[in-house]
Every structure is written in structure tokens, then in C-alpha cells.
């Protein structure tokens, strides 16, 4: 930002009103008036070029320093060419000297040269030659000097003429300030420029109304240079939640809009399924029946729990059930749907029911399922089972109601035994089987049925309480169809699948395990 100049003295704007002192009195410097552009132009002039040694002083009024540390002195003046005077005026000069003196009080008309310190010799860039002067084309020079640091209450400037033909048209004394500034939503106060050229005054900014320094961010700071310019901005402020940046200010979000954190982003429109927000909202409340999960961003629409799984089937396969379902028709507006399966078993005789999680086995953990099917095994025969599939999403925990569907299935048979061939010979087959331990207590005996492959007219049956049997008196090199079925008090359980086992040919010797 451009530096601000604070004027302490302006001769052109006040003329004789300032009451400058000339020394010696009545000689040397003289106050005159010209008219230029419809305005009286005042000047102090001196032109004693023919009179030998000159020492003419012009002292300003006492100038109150105020808060200035370094002052700038701008001079506008004309100097006539010494050659434009007869004989080149041997004592003629084309420069004058600029002095200053600091003091804590106004000495009035008491002028003492010894108190003054020389700032510089002022020389013109252009001198006014005779032809220009006669044509009233004077060459105006502008020179600027600076002095600092100043420490006393006020100061004088003085101009020493040593024999030049000079007209002083403007003397402007000012100091520089870095102007009041709004940047990065921070306000920086008007600040006096320092007095030392290399130094930069660090100035802390304050966030404008409804703006804050972001967490972990730097406090706003700027540097005020000697020339009154702001440099090197550091840090910034951001509009707080509920407010957005409009030009250099933070404005409350309009009704129906919100902003949930301090950021550079504008206010956002309230998402779906929210109530219209008031002015300056940091979030938008959910409509009745809609919710926001703790981890949901405020910009996300409000959602609700899903409806129940749409369609649930329970297909029994012996002591196993495959549960299948389709996703809820209404997802509640969310994609994070998971399913939970629970199981209840009832004894038909007593009608007594209880949870069966401990006695059954699921093909995958029954809670937090993302797939839409699961297989439940190790079910007990002659038992009624009710399976509940509940659909849940990220906001289900915010309501007490549940969305579920149930399916019941009666297990009338044991699970088919798993059969394997333990050994064989030319005339025998050794067979073993297993069923899930929970079902074993209900089995009275096992029935092994076998016959030659291709002979549908006759079959043999063997019963045993154990889990294996050796079938003897078989024909060599012959394939037999073998099935094992559990017998319970209530009747037959599910039969195993029919296995094909072959006896050894006579060339093969011994009892070989397969």
C-alpha cells in the first residue's frame, strides 16, 4: 500500500501566514507574489549576486514534530544562471544551503546560527538562463532531503543564501505513515514509518469482526517501511464458522446457507433433508426423522436408517440353512449399509425358545455383513429356527427402532453324514462317516445301504451305532453304491449322498487303504 504523507509545513499553501524570519532583517530574502493559473503564488527570493560575500538566512516558523521520527523536506525553487548577470558576477553562486535545528520550545525572533546543523547544499538540476527569464520560462527544480531520527518537541529549517539568485516557491515538510490497511481480513493500524532506512517496524494486525486466526496458523503481521509502504505480509485471518468473506469483511451466511468451520470457502447451501437455517448458521439441522452421523460432514445431506431387507429366504439343506436377502428398498440415503443376522431356536415339544448363536456356525461373522447371504450350519434336527436379518447404516444407532425381516425354518432331519472310504480289499470296503457333534446325541443308529452298481433289484442294509463299518462278502473288482443315513427316535435323518466305491481286482493283493 502506498505511503501516507502527513504534512507538517507547507509554505505554498500558507504563504506569509507562517511568519518566517529573515536575517539580517530587511536584507536578503524577501517575500513576493506572482499570479499563476488564477492563483497567487508566494515565494521567498534573494538575488544579491553583485554584492560580494553574502550570508542571508531565512528561517521557518517553529514546527511541532508530533509523532514524526524522520521528516522529508521537499523544495521547489528556481536558480538564475550566473552568466545572465553583467560580467558573470564573480561573487555569484548557483547553490544555497539547507539547515535544521531541533528544540523543545519556540525561540520566536531569537535567531542563532550556531544552533543549526547543515543538511545539504542544494544545487539545481536546471538553471534559468537570460532568454528563459525574459520569456518568463523559469526552470523549476524539485529537490528532496530527509532528516532523522528527530527527538525534540519541534524543529526549524533554515535556508542560507551565499550569493545566488534564488526563488523558493515551495517548502513542504512531511513525515510518512503506513496507512491504515485491511489485508487478509486483518486490520493494520496507521503506523508511523521508522527513521532508519534498513529497519522495518513489525506491526501486529487484528482480525476483522467474525474472522479468526486458523488453528496452527500465524498471527497476521506486516512490516512498515521507512517510505510508508507496507511490506512482507505474514499470516492471515479466516472468516469464522457461519461467516464468509465479502470483499474485506466477514458476512454472516444468508438464511438457508451455512459454513461449519473457519476457512476460505464460501457459505454452502443447506443440504437435502435439513431445515432452513437462520442467518450465520454453522450447520443445518436435520428434518424430523433424519439424522447426521458423528463422522458425517456438515455438507452431507441428513439421512435416516434403512428400511428392512427387502426379501428374505431361508433354504434348509439338512442341518444347514442358506439365508438370502435383497437390500432394503430405502437405503436412507446412505451407502454404509451392513446386516446383522440373529438366530432363535424353539423346541417343538415344549414350545420353549432361546438364542442359538452359541450352537450354530455361520459361514462368516453374522454382524457387520456387507454381502446379502450367509450359510448357517450345525443346526439341530427337529428344531424350529427363526432367523432375523437386520439392516443398519451409520445413523441406525441414533434411533431405537430397528429395520429387520425374519424367516423361520424347521429342521426335520439331521445333516447328511459325510462319508469316506477308509480301506478296501477284493471282497470288502471299510467306510466311515461323521455328523456335527451337536446332532450326534439325537442319533440312535446309522443305516448303511449298499448295492452293486447297475443292479437296481437288490440292496443290502447294515445298522450300527458306531461311525464306521466294514462291508464283507463283496465281489472283487466291482463298484458298489454306498449311502449312510442317521436314524433318530423321530425317524430317518437325511441320507448322505450316494458314493461309488470299488473293490480291488484279484491281481491286487492285501487290504489297501484309499
Amino acid at each position: 500500500a502506498q505511503g501516507k504523507e502527513v504534512v507538517l509545513l507547507d509554505f505554498a499553501a500558507a504563504g506569509g501566514e507562517l511568519g518566517w524570519l529573515t536575517h539580517p532583517y530587511g536584507k536578503g530574502w524577501d517575500l513576493m507574489q506572482n499570479i499563476m493559473n488564477d492563483m497567487p503564488i508566494y515565494m521567498y527570493s534573494v538575488c544579491n549576486v553583485m554584492s560580494g560575500d553574502q550570508d542571508n538566512w531565512l528561517r521557518t516558523n517553529w514546527v511541532y514534530r508530533g509523532e514524526a521520527e524522520r521528516i522529508f523536506i521537499e523544495l521547489k525553487f528556481t536558480v538564475r544562471d550566473c552568466n545572465s548577470f553583467p560580467g558573470g558576477a564573480s561573487s555569484c553562486k548557483e547553490t544555497f544551503n539547507l539547515y535544521y535545528a531541533e528544540s523543545d520550545l519556540d525561540y520566536g525572533t531569537n535567531f542563532q546560527k550556531r544552533l543549526f546543523t547543515k543538511i545539504d547544499t542544494i544545487a539545481p538540476d536546471e538553471i534559468t538562463v537570460s532568454s528563459d527569464f525574459e520569456a518568463r520560462h523559469v526552470k523549476l527544480n524539485v529537490e528532496e532531503r530527509s532528516v532523522g531520527p528527530l527527538t525534540r518537541k519541534g524543529f526549524y529549517l533554515a535556508f542560507q543564501d551565499i550569493g545566488a539568485c534564488v526563488a523558493l516557491l515551495s517548502v513542504r515538510v512531511y513525515y510518512k505513515k503506513c496507512p491504515e490497511l485491511l489485508q487478509g481480513l486483518a486490520h493494520f493500524p496507521e503506523t508511523i514509518a521508522g527513521s532508519d532506512a534498513p529497519s522495518l517496524a513489525t506491526v501486529a494486525g487484528t482480525c476483522v469482526d467474525h474472522a479468526v486466526v486458523p488453528p496452527g496458523g500465524e498471527e497476521p503481521r506486516m512490516h512498515c517501511a521507512v517510505d510508508g509502504e507496507w511490506l512482507v505480509p505474514i499470516g492471515q485471518c479466516l472468516c469464522q464458522a457461519g461467516y464468509e468473506k465479502v470483499e474485506d469483511a466477514c458476512q454472516a451466511c444468508s438464511p438457508g446457507f451455512f459454513k461449519f468451520e473457519a476457512s476460505e470457502s464460501p457459505c454452502l447451501e443447506c443440504p437435502e433433508h435439513t431445515l432452513p437455517s437462520p442467518e450465520g448458521a454453522t450447520s443445518c439441522e436435520c428434518e424430523e426423522g433424519f439424522f447426521r452421523a458423528p463422522q458425517d460432514p456438515a455438507s452431507m445431506p441428513c439421512t435416516r436408517p434403512p428400511s428392512a431387507p427387502h426379501y428374505l429366504t431361508a433354504v434348509g439343506m439338512g442341518a444347514k440353512v442358506e439365508l438370502r436377502w435383497t437390500p432394503p428398498q430405502d437405503s436412507g440415503g446412505r451407502e454404509d449399509i451392513v446386516y446383522s443376522v440373529t438366530c432363535e431356536q424353539c423346541w417343538p415339544e415344549s414350545g420353549e425358545c432361546g438364542p442359538c448363536e452359541a450352537s450354530v456356525r455361520y459361514s462368516e461373522p453374522p454382524h457387520g455383513l456387507t454381502r446379502t447371504s450367509v450359510t448357517v450350519s450345525d443346526l439341530e434336527p427337529h428344531m424350529n429356527y427363526t432367523f432375523t436379518v437386520e439392516a443398519r447404516n451409520g445413523v441406525s444407532g441414533l434411533v431405537t427402532s430397528r429395520s429387520f425381516r425374519t424367516a423361520s425354518v424347521s429342521i426335520n432331519q439331521t445333516e447328511p453324514p459325510k462319508v469316506r472310504l477308509e480301506g478296501r480289499s477284493t471282497t470288502s470296503l471299510s467306510v466311515s462317516w461323521s455328523i456335527p457333534p451337536p446332532q450326534q446325541s439325537r442319533v440312535w443308529k446309522y443305516e448303511v445301504t449298499y448295492r452293486k452298481k447297475g443292479d437296481s433289484n437288490s440292496y443290502n442294509v447294515r445298522r450300527t451305532e458306531g461311525f464306521s463299518v466294514t462291508l464283507d462278502d463283496l465281489a472283487p473288482d466291482t463298484t458298489y453304491l454306498v449311502q449312510v443315513q442317521a436314524l433318530t427316535q423321530e425317524g430317518q435323518g437325511a441320507g448322505s449322498k450316494v458314493h461309488e466305491f470299488q473293490t480291488l481286482s484279484p491281481e491286487g493283493s492285501g487290504n489297501l487303504a484309499v
Partner: antibody, heavy 119, light 106 residues
């Protein structure tokens, strides 16, 4: 004692001209600028221009450049302002005012001349 | 041209009360001048070079300001101070006056 004595009130017809006078006394007439200021009824002040009696140099507010002409008679220490092509807009009190010695304000004022333009 | 805006346009004060009126310039000016005008009288110089009191002006008056903002203050209002006060600048041509602040006694 510095005094500026202005001529009396004027009632003139639209389109005509009028010349108002301001006689100075109590100081060296040629050393000070003489300014003219307009004050419309119940309104603020408007600077018309000035004349430097020493050499007759003048300066005008651009708004009045074609409306007013400033002159002086140094022998009688009198300043004049002629206002031409009068309209009702020119109806006002006109003041002459001495410029502070080589300064930017007006330290002595005449009593004012009321100009009324009416048909 | 520089426009000077005075505020308030009209104000009233009780005897002994402190009074402040302001003059705001459309561009920065180096100095401000103030005049007092009473009904059916010509203006009188009151304050020159921003803060200097003209001859005969009571010490209860003061002027201050810089840049675009200037003010005239009466430390303790008296009946004779009731008048219209005009600010004036001549830092740039043409010289201009403010619209005036009319000060009345309560």
C-alpha cells in the same frame, strides 16, 4: 483601522450588468490582494476571484470567469467587480475581502452588497 | 475542486458545554481556516493555519486536524458563540468553503 466600504444594494433586470465597488482604507491598498466572495441567500460562500492592486494581476474561479470582471483604481483605493448577463441565479450578497498579507485567507471583509436580479 | 463537508449542519449547546464541529475535505489539504458569521453580518476570520486564533478570538476556541479531517472546538459554550461557522481551504485552486455549521444556544 482597516475598513472596506461597499456600495449599496442593487436591483437590476435580467440580462443587464452591474458594477459593485469596495473602497479600502486604513492600509496600503497596493500591498494586499482583494478578493470577492458570493453568498446566495441562506447558502454558503463561493470565491469569485481576486485582484492584486500592485500590478492589476487577477485570478478567477473558472465558474465566474465569464461572469465577473475585477478591476481597481489605485488612486482612490477602490476595487470593483462588474457582473454581466445577469440572471436570477446571480441574486446574492457579494463581499469584498482583503487577503491576509501574502496569505491564503481573508482577514477583513466589507459589509456586503445585496444584488437582486428581477424583471 | 476540493469539496469541504461540515457536520453537523445544525447543532445547539448549553452554556458551559463543550462543542466540536468537523470539516471533512474530499482531498488532503495542508491547512484549514475557519470563519464566524452572525446574521446580517459579514464573516470574520476565526482560526487560520488550522490552529492559530485570529486576533480577538477567545481562548476557549481551538482548531486541529490534518489531511482530510479538521475540527473546531469550543471548550465551554457561551451565548456570544452562537453563529454559523465556515471552514475554508486554499491548498488547491479554487479556494472553497464548507456549507457551514449553525451553532445555537440552548
Amino acid at each position: 483601522e482597516v475598513q472596506l466600504q461597499q456600495s449599496g444594494p442593487e436591483l437590476v433586470k435580467p440580462g443587464a450588468s452591474v458594477k459593485i465597488s469596495c473602497k479600502a482604507s486604513g492600509y496600503t491598498f497596493t500591498d494586499y490582494n482583494m478578493h470577492w466572495v458570493k453568498q446566495s441567500h441562506g447558502k454558503s460562500l463561493e470565491w469569485i476571484g481576486f485582484i492584486y492592486p500592485y500590478n492589476g494581476g487577477t485570478g478567477y474561479n473558472q465558474r465566474f470567469k465569464n461572469k465577473a470582471t475585477l478591476t481597481v483604481d489605485t488612486s482612490s483605493s477602490t476595487a470593483y467587480m462588474e457582473v454581466r448577463s445577469l440572471t436570477s441565479e446571480d441574486s446574492a450578497v457579494y463581499f469584498c475581502a482583503r487577503g491576509y498579507y501574502y496569505g491564503r485567507h481573508f482577514d477583513y471583509w466589507g459589509q456586503g452588497t445585496t444584488l437582486t436580479v428581477s424583471s | 475542486q476540493i469539496v469541504l463537508t461540515q457536520s453537523p449542519a445544525l447543532m445547539s449547546a448549553s452554556p458551559g458545554e463543550k462543542v466540536t464541529m468537523t470539516c471533512s475535505a474530499s482531498s488532503s489539504v495542508s491547512y484549514m481556516y475557519w470563519y464566524q458569521q452572525k446574521p446580517r453580518s459579514s464573516p470574520k476570520p476565526w482560526i487560520y493555519i488550522t490552529s492559530n486564533l485570529a486576533s480577538g478570538v477567545p481562548a476557549r476556541f481551538s482548531g486541529s486536524g490534518s489531511g482530510t479531517s479538521y475540527s473546531l472546538t469550543i471548550s465551554s459554550m457561551e451565548a456570544e458563540d452562537a453563529a454559523t461557522y465556515y471552514c475554508q481551504q486554499w491548498s488547491s485552486n479554487p479556494p472553497t468553503f464548507g456549507g457551514g455549521t449553525k451553532l445555537e444556544i440552548k
